[in-house]
């Protein structure tokens, strides 16, 4: 399947529009600080070069790898050293080390200004004036802030973004039409980015086998009627797609994702009965739809798992001679029977099964040793079930905001060394599990909740990796991908933590809080709550609740005052003094 010119091959496969968009995403994800205009210039140069290769694949440099071509282009940026510091050293390396070097410098939390949404009329004017630039800017701004965003999926988001403006800029009430659509895209985009970040972390930190195991479990739940060989083929192809995207090979990734969607739709009869609608859609919608498709119904009369995985005389032989196949079959068979389990739970069960076989197979009576292996699964299943039950009860009792606050306190006490913005962001996201999952019936709660928590805790792990401050976080993040959530759940209050010095400035608020959105105001209050816990880690729930209630009343009072700033100054001093007294600071 070798092509004389890889760049020509991808240009022809993807078409000019997608080619340009994907190169822009790739460049923005690597050089996150570069101005938009610089990236557009680089993309245009690459595109013109690609066209010369399409015309003549034997033309000079057309035989070079995409990494070589793109890397050479990125290394022409004049301000590389000033803007990126040591990342400029990547340019002294040869491929593939140069690309690895660029990948290592991707920043999950780049120092970029918050995206402020202009007025609707301003956006509509910009959209009409230059639609192409407007949409490119969207790709650029998302890609540089989310350097692992799944590129072919970002093309889908851009298509929806364009559709929203096309429709709403002609509407009578532009804002009423557009703003909810943009909010939905923003929230879905953040979720999509976080989900993809976990896939990349899984591949990069735990290896291909970890990702494949995840994919076997998930696809077996989704396609329980498909044969193991079919699931294995899909897993192999899906792994290739995500390996490419996570490795910065976005053209190959998008091309292979399109091929995979085509294959799935051509073979839907042997995969799933739920694919029909997806397969009638255009490419980007089709791929997205397949990725989100509901689980197919389980085949009737599936036999007991015990026959093949406990009772068979060949269990140990099959395990020893091909662990990947045998354990893959175990995972497939277990997952297709259990759409009610989270993927991480299924992987824990498979690991327990593997560990038991490894311990038992060399024993004098292997069968006697592993006969009760399924009994070992019971506590593993009950632990997330109980945790979800307790937390959904708490969520229903408190509501989302107060549930987030309970988690903020819980996690700040567990890992108080973590930065306040990270604790706020992660705990707020952890708290969203309530409204996202607790509404579901029992059979859907665990896959929703625990797999979502895996995504959120991965955010904590990648942010912490950038500036590690807590050995406990490092341990939970690196020891086992599937046991991250149980590891964090098991953490108690960090008794070694020396409370933070009290700083009145941290608790000084101004009138600008009154003009903030409800969400921003919540974040301010939650930031104060984390700081309180860092000052007084032994504070009780009741103490913290009293202080937070006083704080909410103080904000409400001063925002109603005529002279807001004076109110914040005077009442703020009183509040700080009262809080110090209440907490014994």
């Amino acid at each position: 399947d070798a092509h004389k010119s890889e760049v020509a091959h991808r240009f022809k496969d993807l078409g000019e529009e997608n080619f340009k968009a994907l190169v822009l995403i790739a460049f923005a994800q690597y050089l996150q600080q570069c101005p938009f205009e610089d990236h557009v210039k680089l993309v245009n140069e690459v595109t013109e070069f690609a066209k010369t290769c399409v015309a003549d694949e034997s033309a000079e440099n057309c035989d070079k790898s995409l990494h070589t071509l793109f890397g050479d282009k990125l290394c022409t940026v004049a301000t590389l050293r000033e803007t990126y510091g040591e990342m400029a050293d990547c340019c002294a390396k040869q491929e593939p080390e140069r690309n690895e070097c660029f990948l290592q410098h991707k920043d999950d939390n780049p120092n970029l200004p918050r995206l402020v949404r202009p007025e609707v009329d301003v956006m509509c004017t910009a959209f009409h004036d230059n639609e192409e630039t407007f949409l490119k800017k969207y790709l650029y701004e998302i890609a540089r802030r989310h350097p692992y965003f799944y590129a072919p999926e970002l093309l889908f988001f851009a298509k929806r973004y364009k559709a929203a403006f096309t429709e709403c800029c002609q509407a009578a009430d532009k804002a009423a039409c557009l703003l909810p659509k943009l909010d939905e895209l923003r929230d879905e985009g953040k979720a999509s980015s976080a989900k993809q970040r976990l896939k990349c972390a899984s591949l990069q930190k735990f290896g291909e086998r970890a990702f494949k195991a995840w994919a076997v479990a998930r696809l077996s739940q989704r396609f329980p009627k498909a044969e193991f060989a079919e699931v294995s083929k899909l897993v192999t192809d899906l792994t290739k797609v995500h390996t490419e995207c996570c490795h910065g090979d976005l053209l190959e990734c998008a091309d292979d994702r399109a091929d995979l969607a085509k294959y799935i739709c051509e073979n839907q009869d042997s995969i799933s009965s739920k694919l029909k609608e997806c397969c009638e859609k255009p490419l980007l919608e089709k791929s997205h739809c397949i990725a989100e498709v509901e689980n197919d119904e389980m085949p009737a009369d599936l036999p007991s798992l015990a026959a093949d995985f406990v009772e068979s005389k060949d269990v140990c032989k099959n395990y020893a001679e091909a662990k990947d196949v045998f354990l893959g079959m175990f995972l497939y068979e277990y997952a297709r029977r259990h759409p009610d389990y989270s993927v991480v739970l299924l992987l824990r069960l498979a690991k327990t099964y593997e560990t038991t076989l490894e311990k038992c197979c060399a024993a004098a009576d292997p069968h006697e040793c592993y006969a009760k292996v399924f009994d070992e699964f019971k506590p593993l299943v009950e632990e997330p079930q109980n945790l979800i039950k307790q937390n959904c009860e708490l969520f229903e009792q408190l509501g989302e905001y107060k549930f987030q606050n309970a988690l903020l306190v819980r996690y700040t006490k567990k890992v108080p060394q973590v930065s306040t913005p990270t604790l706020v962001e992660v705990s707020r996201n952890l708290g969203k599990v309530g409204s996202k999952c607790c509404k579901h019936p029992e059979a859907k709660r665990m896959p929703c909740a625990e797999d979502y928590l895996s995504v959120v805790l991965n955010q904590l792990c990648v942010l912490h990796e950038k500036t590690p401050v807590s050995d406990r976080v490092t341990k939970c993040c690196t020891e086992s991908l599937v046991n991250r959530r149980p590891c964090f759940s098991a953490l108690e209050v960090d008794e070694t933590y020396v409370p933070k010095e009290f700083n009145a400035e941290t608790f000084t608020f101004h009138a600008d809080i009154c003009t903030l959105s409800e969400k921003e105001r919540q974040i301010k209050k939650q930031t104060a709550l984390v700081e309180l816990v860092k000052h007084k880690p032994k504070a009780t729930k009741e103490q913290l609740k009293a202080v937070m209630d006083d704080f909410a009343a103080f904000v409400e009072k001063c925002c109603k005052a005529d002279d807001k700033e004076t109110c914040f100054a005077e009442e703020g001093k009183k509040l700080v003094a009262a809080s110090q007294a209440a907490l014994g600071l």
Epitope: E208, R209, K317, A322, E358, K359, C361, A363
Partner: antibody
């Protein structure tokens, strides 16, 4: 003290056969997996195969067919039967126990002192 | 085909030196099924490290192992006279039949 002791090595002609023994003392062999590993003069280690406590055997791909591992728990001994020997089979042959609690992992905690097999005409 | 490549094949070092030996596997070993052995002339190998980083009982703490997947390292933090020997890595794979050792690294006195 646990000991593994290989015997049965010596000079053998190409095409010939040899049976090596690994006598185990200090533990009940019936509970453990035993491996055979060889080392050609001045070369590295090469895994030959394993026999589990249950008697199930597995071999390196290259060893299948010519080499057979067996055990006699009553004698606390494991055997390596080698057929159609070639000059390149000349090596010190070791028996080694797999660390208890593992079945397929390359963790061998107790080794014999080795027995030299020379294949030459 | 399974490849277990050890490097360097030999290293000259002095007492007190830090010595690092690497082992590269293709394909990746089964979930950290990697061991390190020490062998002195005329003697049987001795298991130092298993599961890539766990020290066998009685092995001095100056020995440490790290790595996962395809790349592994054995480090001797401060070489002692009794550490001059040949070191082998051993890898386990999806199939037990693929159990393999690296080519060895001889640690010699400088």
């Amino acid at each position: 003290e646990v000991q593994l002791l290989e015997s049965g090595g010596g000079l053998v002609q190409p095409g010939g056969s040899l049976r090596l023994s690994c006598a185990v003392s200090g533990i009940d062999l019936s509970n453990y997996a035993i491996n055979w590993v060889r080392q050609a003069p001045g070369k590295g280690l090469e895994w030959i195969g394993i026999i589990w406590a249950s008697g199930t055997t597995f071999y390196a791909t290259w060893a299948k067919g010519r080499f057979t591992i067996s055990r006699d728990n009553s004698k606390n001994t494991v055997y390596l039967q080698m057929n159609s020997l070639r000059a390149e089979d000349t090596a010190v042959y070791y028996c080694a126990r797999t660390v208890p609690g593992y079945s397929t992992a390359p963790y061998f905690d107790l080794w014999g002192q080795g027995t030299l097999v020379t294949v030459s005409s | 085909d399974i490849q277990m490549t050890q490097s360097p094949s030999s290293v000259s070092a002095s007492v007190g030196d830090r010595v690092t030996i690497t082992c590269q596997s293709s394909p990746s070993v089964w979930i950290n099924f990697l061991s390190w052995y020490q062998q002195k002339p005329g003697k049987a190998p001795k298991l130092l490290i298993y599961e890539a980083s766990k020290l066998t009982s009685g092995v001095p703490s100056r020995f440490s192992g790290s790595g996962s997947g395809t790349d592994f390292t054995l480090t001797i933090s401060s070489l002692q006279p009794e550490d001059f020997a040949t070191y082998y890595c051993g890898g386990g794979y999806s199939s037990i039949s693929d159990t393999t050792f690296g080519g060895g690294t001889k640690v010699e006195i400088k």
